[in-house]
């Protein structure tokens, strides 16, 4: 529970006045504003907006709110030259082409600036040849093409299914690979439910439905030109050439009418076996190129969209604290949309908003935080984290002294079914603690804690008893601050039910039906699981800003810690015998985290039982326990991605969206039977061990007593 | 309510041009593919021309390819249908169509027709 006394204020001001101050009727109001026209990156619609947000926000009561504009380099279609694939004949004639843009939904159809479906940061070109379908293109698929099958996607278009991992990941792989362009489709397998009607009629994706998305390979750099620094005035720019993750090959995205079009004539190597077939009538034949009849038509692809420098616009709200002003508990989101963003992210900004409107309800009552808070609407998320890196590259010195703790909110529903939490260890028991408190929305669970329903429907794979909690990956605005910055971050959102559902994210992602009503008609009609999100992430941010001693317990990272190393070192005993040649052992890995393990339990100890009324003391222990995710930040980051710095976890290099452990030993580690020189890459692994050892070691001795 | 109005029908020489609109009206054309299809006195229906909702793609029955062009103006809600070098043969009501599918990319089923235009082609 929050402690009122260090803030002075009356014992009304306490979480539980935040909490029922939250509305849904206000969440869903904030939702149809946020919702009724485009609001793309760069442009016109999205300022206004932001300006509309500042307004808003200073009206809640925030002591002030600023614009922080930046110009980064984002991509966009060639209004008059659309971006399209066709089938041609042995002439060269165009036999088949596909959509230029998707049939609007009911009640949009005049709506104007709906961007039509694209790759963003895709180059330009019009590379035709045999098509090759590569499944989901992720490393194993590639292994299986080459390896397996021996097929060789060197100088082809290959053609590859949305789903499983970050869309970047599969460019890359195509990339290197050798093709010389990708088509990127929505298989019903994945984007369509059993039993649920199409948009308008259901939360399905209908088949002239496509998802829109960046295609970079940015690994936390931000703003491709300016890579560790902000975009700002007097920016010093790379030229294009020397831009960080940019795809060199041409990529496009269809729906799965245009899909069947192009897979239906396949011919060459059949699948593989079953988990390479989607839902589509059609072979699922990976070429390379058409059977028989159809074997001298050619794939071509029309792509002329351009990258542009442009401006872009975060909103920042400061709530600043009573007692300890100089420390900040963020809460961000981002506002930019691919088109209306009725699920990605407004309905995460209304969440954002009503919050911001309950603690500035609290604040005109006389009460304030004890720590800072800031309020963010981040821009251009959707290329690529823009608008949250480049403000966190601005203001790193003052984030990595100051920064107790992010909170993410992006969308705050991909489904009804249950919570769903990744974040920091040091944020477990913060979690746990708030859900308890918090009743569950769910039918069947009524006059239940949200921690029931969640535990119930999401158990950990662990801990009996307990609720799933997994790592925090990237794709989202809080890469920047977790894994760049190394403050402890944390996101939730309502999910779907993974057992039942094995489509990849929601149907509508990043399409145009991705509206207002989609989630008013199917979603959350009553806005109980939105309010349910405002009051997890309201909860946390209030937590955190509020309690005495920081809601952290290192003991829970211990045991992670502890997780993780039994993880990595199963993988590597797969190779016994070079482990034996090679001298490998994780014997300082483990001492390492033993000591951590012994380390923190003293320090929660210490922690139970100093004196709180003792302003130093209290500091330095919440320093301590702020610091520690800083402690596992390597200046010199992961080899090859040096923004991304965190030891213990960082993004898959196969998939950006997740998290991987002990990242420097997994990579080190990866496919290492296939390296040229085993020498070597064993050499590495030791490396690897040796830097997460002594990060380990080194982060537990910030939790040793100061003298 | 949802209807389809065809016009520019008439009566026209061998060899010479029409064009025939459809103007839709009670549902939004812009998510459709529409088809113009006709009937000649005392025959079947035949399918003449098929458009995708957004223009990308146009197919034409053998019998007119060449000389008939399917085009559409979704801002205005309406189909068109550019006949050349027009034959006797070409005599027929032509009956504007709409395609049940939303996005369809290849023609399926109909589910709204209009009244149809005569096109007579006589010397």
């Known amino acids: 529970k929050s402690s009122n006394e260090a803030t002075n204020i009356t014992p009304k001001h306490n979480m539980k006045a935040f909490l029922d101050e939250l509305k849904a009727e206000n969440i869903k109001k904030f939702l149809y504003n946020f919702t009724q026209i485009p609001h793309l990156a760069g442009t016109e619609q999205n300022f206004q907006l932001a300006k509309q947000i500042q307004s808003q926000w200073k009206e809640f009561g925030l002591d002030s709110v600023e614009l922080a504009h930046y110009d980064v380099l984002l991509s966009y279609p060639n209004k008059t030259h659309p971006n399209y694939i066709s089938i041609i004949n042995e002439d060269g004639n165009e036999i088949f082409n596909t959509s230029l843009f998707e049939p609007p939904p009911p009640g949009y159809e005049n709506v104007s600036d709906i961007v039509p479906p694209f790759s963003a940061f895709s180059p330009q070109g019009m590379p035709e040849g045999d098509l090759v379908y590569v499944n989901y293109a992720r490393t194993e698929d590639f292994f299986k093409l080459e390896r397996d099958m021996k097929i060789n996607c060197s100088g082809k278009i290959v053609i590859a299914r949305y789903g499983k991992v970050f869309r970047g990941n599969k460019v890359k792989n195509a990339q290197l690979a050798g093709a010389k362009g990708v088509i990127l489709y929505s298989d019903p397998a994945d984007y369509f439910a059993p039993g649920v009607k199409s948009y308008p009629d259901g939360w399905n994706l209908p088949g002239g439905g496509v998802q829109r998305g960046n295609i970079l390979n940015l690994n936390g750099a931000g703003d491709p030109l300016t890579p560790g620094y902000p975009a700002n005035e007097y920016a010093y720019r790379r030229g294009i050439a020397e831009a960080v993750g940019l795809p060199s090959i041409p990529v496009h995205p269809i729906g799965y009418y245009d899909a069947q079009k192009l897979l239906e004539k396949m011919g060459g190597s059949a699948p593989p076996d079953s988990s390479w077939r989607g839902s589509l009538k059609v072979p699922y034949n990976v070429g390379p190129g058409f059977t028989g009849n159809f074997s001298t038509q050619k794939v071509k692809m029309h792509i002329h969209s351009t990258n542009e420098v442009t401006r872009i616009y975060n909103v920042i709200g400061t709530l600043r604290g009573a007692v300890e002003p100089d420390r900040y508990v963020i809460l961000g989101g981002h506002r930019d949309s691919w088109v209306f963003g009725g699920i990605d992210p407004q309905s995460g900004a209304a969440v954002v908003h009503e919050i911001v409107r309950s603690f500035g309800t609290l604040k005109k009552e006389g009460w304030r935080p004890r720590r800072t808070i800031l309020f963010a609407s981040w821009d251009a998320e959707e290329f690529g984290l823009l608008g949250s890196t480049e403000w966190a590259e601005e203001n790193s010195r003052l984030l990595q002294e100051r920064g107790v703790a992010y909170i993410n909110a992006d969308s705050s529903i991909e489904g009804n079914y249950t919570l769903r939490v990744d974040c920091t260890p040091l944020m477990y028991s913060l979690v746990h603690n708030l859900t308890k408190e918090l009743k569950s929305p769910d039918e069947g669970f009524e006059g239940k804690s949200l921690y029931e329903s969640w535990t119930k429907k999401s158990p950990s794979p662990e801990f009996s008893g307990m609720p799933r909690i997994s790592k925090l990956g990237s794709g989202n605005d809080f890469e920047v601050f977790f894994q760049r910055l190394g403050i402890a971050s944390g996101r939730a959102r309502y999910t779907k039910n993974w057992e039942t559902n094995k489509f990849s994210g929601y149907p509508l992602y990043h399409s145009v039906y991705e509206t207002y009503e989609l989630v008013e008609k199917f979603y959350d009609p009553m806005f109980k699981y939105h309010l349910t999100v405002a009051q997890v992430r309201g909860g946390m941010v209030f937590e955190l800003a509020n309690s005495i001693v920081l809601p952290f317990d290192c003991r829970d990272y211990a045991v992670v810690l502890r997780k993780y190393a039994d993880k990595i070192y199963s993988i590597s005993m797969k190779h016994p015998q070079e482990m034996k040649t090679y001298s490998v052992s994780f014997d300082s890995l483990f001492s390492a985290v033993k000591n951590f393990t012994e380390i923190a339990s003293k320090f929660s100890e210490r922690l139970q039982d100093f004196d709180k009324s003792n302003p130093i003391v209290l500091r330095m222990m919440n320093d301590q326990l702020m610091f520690l995710e800083r402690a596992f930040i390597d200046p010199l980051g992961l080899p090859d991605r040096p923004f991304y710095r965190h030891v213990i976890y960082a993004p898959s290099s196969h998939n950006k969206y997740a998290g991987e452990s002990f990242p420097g030993i997994y990579d080190a580690l990866f496919d290492i039977e296939s390296k040229v020189d085993p020498s070597k890459a064993w050499g590495e692994v030791k490396r690897q061990i040796y830097v997460a050892a002594f990060t380990v070691q080194a982060a537990a001795e910030t939790l040793s007593e100061v003298a | 309510e949802v209807q389809l109005v065809e016009s520019g029908g008439g009566v026209v020489q061998p060899g010479r041009s029409l064009r025939l609109s459809c103007a839709a009206s009670g549902f939004p054309l812009i998510s459709y593919g529409m088809n113009w299809v006709r009937q000649a006195p005392g025959k079947g229906l035949d399918w003449v021309a098929f458009?995708?909702?957004?223009?990308?793609?146009?197919y034409y029955a053998d019998s007119v390819k060449g000389r008939f062009t399917i085009s559409r103006d979704n801002s205005k809600n309406t189909l068109y249908l550019q006949m050349n070098s027009l034959r006797p043969e070409d005599t027929a009501v032509y009956y504007c169509?709409?395609?049940?599918?939303?996005?369809?990319?290849?023609?399926?089923?109909?589910?709204?027709w209009g009244q149809g235009t005569l096109v007579t082609v006589s010397s």
């Open positions: 169509a709409k395609d049940r599918i939303v996005g369809a990319r290849v023609p399926d089923a109909y589910d709204i």
């Open positions: 458009i995708t909702y957004d223009g990308s793609n146009r």
